[in-house]
């Protein structure tokens, strides 16, 4: 066909953005391209091509009006992870094409076991108490929080410090005796541990 | 169409090696595991291990380790399965099977049958 | 390895009876737990994946209950074409039940 004066090349106008999303929930990939004619969109991922409702009418992947990539909901298996991965979108007519940023899609995991449970302990009163756990596997990194006879435990408390996994007391009072569960939580939700009792002896 | 189409029927003789291939079409290979399977004559389903398209890395059950070999070759988006040192017992049909991102095997080959005879 | 029990082996029944399958792993696997049908002469099909959920296409008479090491699945009311084997797969370690042959009573 003969170039008209008014068409012109693909540009990419809107990029796609990194994204973190839940197993299971909805996402979407932005992008937008000018060009004249107007130009057809494509997502690859790791350099191949993203298949979606127009190659197969089942797939979970669509491509929308605008161009941008919908997933009606993120597919991640304990081994197959079709969804994660780098993505770019290129935007092609008769005069050529554009290539958008890079974007990551990671998937936000939390599992359900705990690494390390932790354990009863019995002290004195006055003596330091030291709990310990290790949460589940997850991604983002889950943060350490821990509950007391079911209600979240004061950290303002000077003599309580939460540190990566540990929990420690560093004198213990009679009213710190209790049942302790550690939780971990990232944007997945939260998991919590196996309870562990904390003693605390008169001396 | 998500599809896997296996290679031909084979009659090999103990002791010889067969090589089943699998081809991948209407996904994107790299990104689900690939896993075969087999099934000897009225017997039930017996998994042989897998491959992760996107490197290469393989894990296979004990008893095929050291006689299986699976690989892959991405630009045509075909796996294989090498199966040595064959005896009369491995005589069956070996499927290609995709795991979905749901832990399951929910595309699978047609099946190729396997002969081991002497 | 996890090793997966299915019973019954075989089981006779009528159009229109409701069929129960169980399947049994040797340690708690969650709700890691697949079930397919298969045909004489064809490839396994996907019925249900994670114990309960139902697999795009499977019609609604199928459905998976169960989590940890006891699962179920029941076909509510048997159709003609439901006749066939049926196999139980844990998606930890991915080895089969032994499968359950359904026939014509």
């Known amino acids: 066909s003969r170039l008209r004066q008014e068409d012109f090349p693909p540009r990419i106008v809107e990029h796609p953005s990194d994204l973190i999303v839940s197993k299971g929930e909805p996402a979407t990939l932005n992008c937008k391209a000018e060009g004249r004619p107007t130009p057809t969109i494509e997502w690859y991922k790791g350099g191949e091509r993203v298949e979606t409702d127009k190659d197969d009418p089942r797939s979970h992947r669509m491509l929308l009006p605008s161009g941008s990539l919908f997933f009606l909901r993120i597919v991640h298996g304990r081994r197959s992870k079709p969804d994660e991965g780098v993505y770019v979108c290129v935007a092609r007519n008769y005069l050529g094409e554009a290539v958008s940023h890079n974007a990551s899609l990671e998937v936000a995991i939390l599992r359900d076991d705990f690494r390390q449970n932790p354990s009863d302990v019995m002290v004195a009163v006055g003596e330091p108490a030291v709990m310990e756990c290790q949460p589940p596997r997850g991604h983002p990194e889950p943060t350490i929080s821990w509950k007391k006879d079911g209600s979240p435990l004061d950290d303002k408390d000077e003599r309580i410090t939460i540190r990566g996994g540990k929990l420690m007391i560093t004198y213990t009072r009679k009213s710190d005796a209790g049942k302790y569960v550690c939780v971990g939580t990232n944007m997945v939700g939260e998991r919590e541990s196996e309870v562990a009792e904390l003693t605390v002896l008169e001396r | 169409e998500v599809q896997l189409v296996q290679s031909g029927a084979e009659v090999k003789k103990p002791g010889a090696s067969v090589k089943v291939s699998c081809k991948a079409s209407?996904?994107?290979?790299?990104?689900?595991?690939m896993h075969w399977v087999r099934q000897a004559p009225g017997q039930g389903l017996e998994w042989m291990g897998w491959i992760n398209p996107k490197n290469g890395d393989t894990e296979f059950p004990q008893k095929f380790q050291g006689r299986v070999t699976m690989t892959r070759d991405t630009s045509i988006t075909t796996a294989y399965m090498e199966l040595s040192r064959l005896r009369s017992d491995d005589t069956a049909v070996y499927y290609c099977a995709r795991e979905s991102g749901d832990d399951a095997f929910d595309i699978w080959g047609q099946g190729t049958m396997v002969t081991v005879s002497s | 390895d996890i090793q997966m029990t299915q019973s019954p082996s075989s089981l006779s029944a009528s159009v229109g009876d409701r069929v129960t399958i169980t399947c049994r792993a040797s340690?708690?696997?969650?709700?890691?737990l697949n079930w397919y049908q298969q045909k004489p002469g064809k490839a396994p099909k996907l019925l249900i994946y994670?114990?309960?959920s139902l697999q795009s296409g499977v019609p609604s008479r199928f459905s998976g209950s169960g989590s940890g090491t006891d699962f179920t699945l029941t076909i509510s009311s048997l159709q003609p074409e439901d006749f066939a084997t049926y196999y139980c797969q844990q998606s930890v370690g991915l080895f089969f039940g032994g499968g359950t042959k359904v026939e014509i009573k």
């Open positions: 209407g996904y994107t290979f790299t990104g689900y595991y």
């Open positions: 340690q708690s696997i969650s709700s890691y």
């Open positions: 994670a114990a309960s």
